[in-house]
Interface confidence: low
């Protein structure tokens, strides 16, 4: 069966997100991937979206993330825009209203996005074969 267009959009967004670092991609987020053995795929996507929403809600207007130069400001704004798009598409893929995020483990946003990209690429390779 064909891959969901949303999945392709997610991978495209993740590729853009992981291409460049910003002042705040090294901040920590909840690592939902650390112990996700008994978690369904839909729950994983839902929880990933929740983590991203928490991040951009907290840091969208963080002056330390915005930086002190036009380039840093632009990069941070772009990061937030991509995270919002990713959040929206993950919710669509998950099809769940809400999901708990209780893990204590932390990961940098950068590592979180790389891990999510790996998962999405694996899913894409399965549905496209």
């Amino acid at each position: 069966h064909k891959c969901d267009i949303t999945l392709q959009e997610i991978i495209k967004t993740l590729n853009s997100l992981t291409e460049q670092k910003t002042l705040c991609t090294e901040l920590t987020v909840t690592d939902i991937f650390a112990a996700s053995k008994n978690t369904t795929e839909k729950e994983t996507f839902c929880r990933a979206a929740t983590v991203l929403r928490q991040f951009y809600s907290h840091h969208e207007k963080d002056t330390r993330c915005l930086g002190a130069t036009a380039q840093q400001f632009h990069r941070h704004k772009q990061l937030i825009r991509f995270l919002k798009r990713l959040d929206r598409n993950l919710w669509g893929l998950a099809g769940l209203n809400s999901c708990p995020v209780k893990e204590a483990n932390q990961s940098t946003l950068e590592n979180f996005l790389e891990r999510l990209k790996t998962i999405m690429r694996e899913k894409y390779s399965k549905c496209s074969s």
Partner: nanobody
Framework: EVQLLESGGGLVQPGGSLRLSCAAS????????MGWVRQAPGKGLEWVSF????????YYADSVKGRFTISRDNSKNTLYLQMNSLRAEDTAVYYC?????????WGQGTLVTVSS
């Protein structure tokens, strides 16, 4: 327990140089971006510089760009700030910070005084 210990501050004349160090312990240093922030007497906090975990990307406030250089040695768990062409307005307490943007851990700070 996370610990950040700054050193290298002191009194220096305008145009002079100083090198600040920050010895980190209690966490996986190489996994985190690190930064320097400062607080001038009677003023608020100002972020100075930031370096990513790998050390490949660095960022500077406009006020120090071209004069300050941030670096790190992950094998020694140490963060550095080389400060050249110092000015009176650089006088401040300089803090080493883990994960700039959230400031989850701080050092005690080291005082840099630029005066003739």
């Amino acid at each position: 327990e996370v610990q950040l210990l700054e050193s290298g501050g002191g009194l220096v004349q305008p145009g002079g140089s100083l090198r600040l160090s920050c010895a980190a312990s209690g966490f996986t240093f190489e996994a985190y971006g690190m930064g320097w922030v400062r607080q001038a007497p009677g003023k608020g906090l100002e972020w100075v510089s930031f370096i990513t975990s790998s050390g490949l990307s660095t960022y500077y406030a406009d006020s120090v760009k071209g004069r300050f250089t941030i670096s790190r040695d992950n094998s020694k768990n140490t963060l550095y700030l080389q400060m050249n062409s110092l000015r009176a307005e650089d006088t401040a307490v300089y803090y080493c910070a883990k994960s700039l943007g959230r400031f989850d851990y701080w050092g005690q700070g080291t005082l840099v005084t630029v005066s003739s």
